[in-house]
């Protein structure tokens, strides 16, 4: 559900939202690192209805979700890719 996303597009986000999105509505969270065609880090949430929301990286709720996902991924053995 957490994905580091590289794009040739410049910044994808013009406005960022801090509004909480319940986990049940989230399909994937994409993180575009700073410098990847854009001077700032961007967090893009894909909702299950295919709408895309740019989230303020400082929003408490997204930081909590990302921390939880990081912990989960570090405790899960890597899956081989064929």
């Amino acid at each position: 559900v957490l994905e580091v996303y590289y794009t040739h597009l410049r910044c994808r986000c013009v406005q960022e939202s801090s509004v909480f999105i319940p986990r049940r509505f989230i399909d994937r969270i994409q993180i575009s690192p700073r410098g990847n065609g854009c001077p700032r880090k961007e967090i893009i949430v894909w909702k299950k209805n295919k709408s895309v929301v740019c989230v303020d990286p400082q929003a408490e709720w997204i930081q909590r979700i990302m921390e939880m996902l990081r912990k989960k991924s570090s405790s899960t053995p890597p899956v081989p890719v064929f």
Epitope: E3, T7, L9, R12, C13, V14, Q15, S17, R28, W46, K47, N49, K50, S51, V52, V53, C54
Partner: antibody, heavy 123, light 111 residues
Framework: QVQLQESGPGLVKPSETLSLTCTVS??????????VGWIRQPPGKGLEWIAH???????RYNPALKSRVTISKDTSKNQFSLKLSSVTAADTAVYYC???????????????WGQGTTVTVSS | DIQMTQSPSSLSASVGDRVTITCRAS??????????MHWYQQKPGKAPKLLIF???DLESGVPSGFSGSGSRTDFTLTISSLQPEDFATYYC?????????FGQGTKLEIK
């Protein structure tokens, strides 16, 4: 590089079902965020979006055509298809398959297009 | 549905001219600060080709003589200095709301 190629019969009889296939290369239909779709253009007229399908099989249809249209995909063959039932002369058009850019989900755009295939509806 | 109206429907111009095509949407196509308006070029017998996305972003490989501007309901495509290969039909498209809709096209012809 990204390529899309339409195929199907060039002539369909009125009241029958038009079936087209688009074979893609350079990307996978199952990649997260991937969407592909169909657009048509009647002779001498403008473009009309018909339908598109997402990586997870979610389908979106133009309400004006929804009752007659089915879009589907076969990821293993790198193909997606369009079926349009009960065709009339008004469905005569060039049919294009296209790939959605993949940045904004339901608010995206068509970044890559096939060259188009002409379908004539006539008895 | 959002209706897209392009003007003019056809336009005669000469090589080197500056040309502006407008597209008006029946309601705003903006969301979260982004205008979901895109422009395509189509030459006879060919598929449309993406020129501009998000109202003003130039697609990779498109000459810098093309530019787009506008927000909410009113948008323009400008060609700063017409080249022989620019004579074609141009379409706008909105994707802010389903169904995605296109303008009727503007045919750019040689004067």
């Amino acid at each position: 590089q990204v390529q899309l190629q339409e195929s199907g019969p060039g002539l369909v009889k009125p009241s029958e079902t038009l079936s087209l296939t688009c074979t893609v290369s350079g990307f996978s239909l199952s990649t997260f965020g991937m969407g592909v779709g169909w657009i048509r253009q009647p002779p001498g007229k403008g473009l009309e979006w018909i339908a598109h399908i997402w990586w997870d099989d979610d389908r979106r249809y133009n309400p004006a055509l929804k009752s007659r249209v089915t879009i589907s995909k076969d990821t293993s063959k790198n193909q997606f298809s369009l079926k349009l039932s009960s065709v009339t002369a008004a469905d005569t058009a060039v049919y294009y398959c296209a790939r959605i850019a993949g940045y904004y989900g339901s608010r995206d755009w068509f970044a890559y297009w096939g060259q188009g295939t002409t379908v004539t509806v006539s008895s | 549905d959002i209706q897209m109206t392009q003007s003019p429907s056809s336009l005669s111009a000469s090589v080197g001219d500056r040309v502006t095509i407008t597209c008006r949407a029946s309601e705003s196509v903006d969301n979260s600060g982004i205008s979901f308006m895109h422009w395509y070029q189509q030459k006879p017998g060919k598929a449309p080709k993406l020129l501009i996305f998000r109202a003003s972003d130039l697609e990779s490989g498109v000459p810098s003589g093309f530019s787009g501007s506008g927000s909410r309901t009113d948008f323009t495509l400008t060609i700063s200095s017409l080249q022989p290969e620019d004579f074609a039909t141009y379409y706008c498209q909105q994707s802010n709301k389903d169904p995605w809709t296109f303008g009727q096209g503007t045919k750019l012809e040689i004067k």
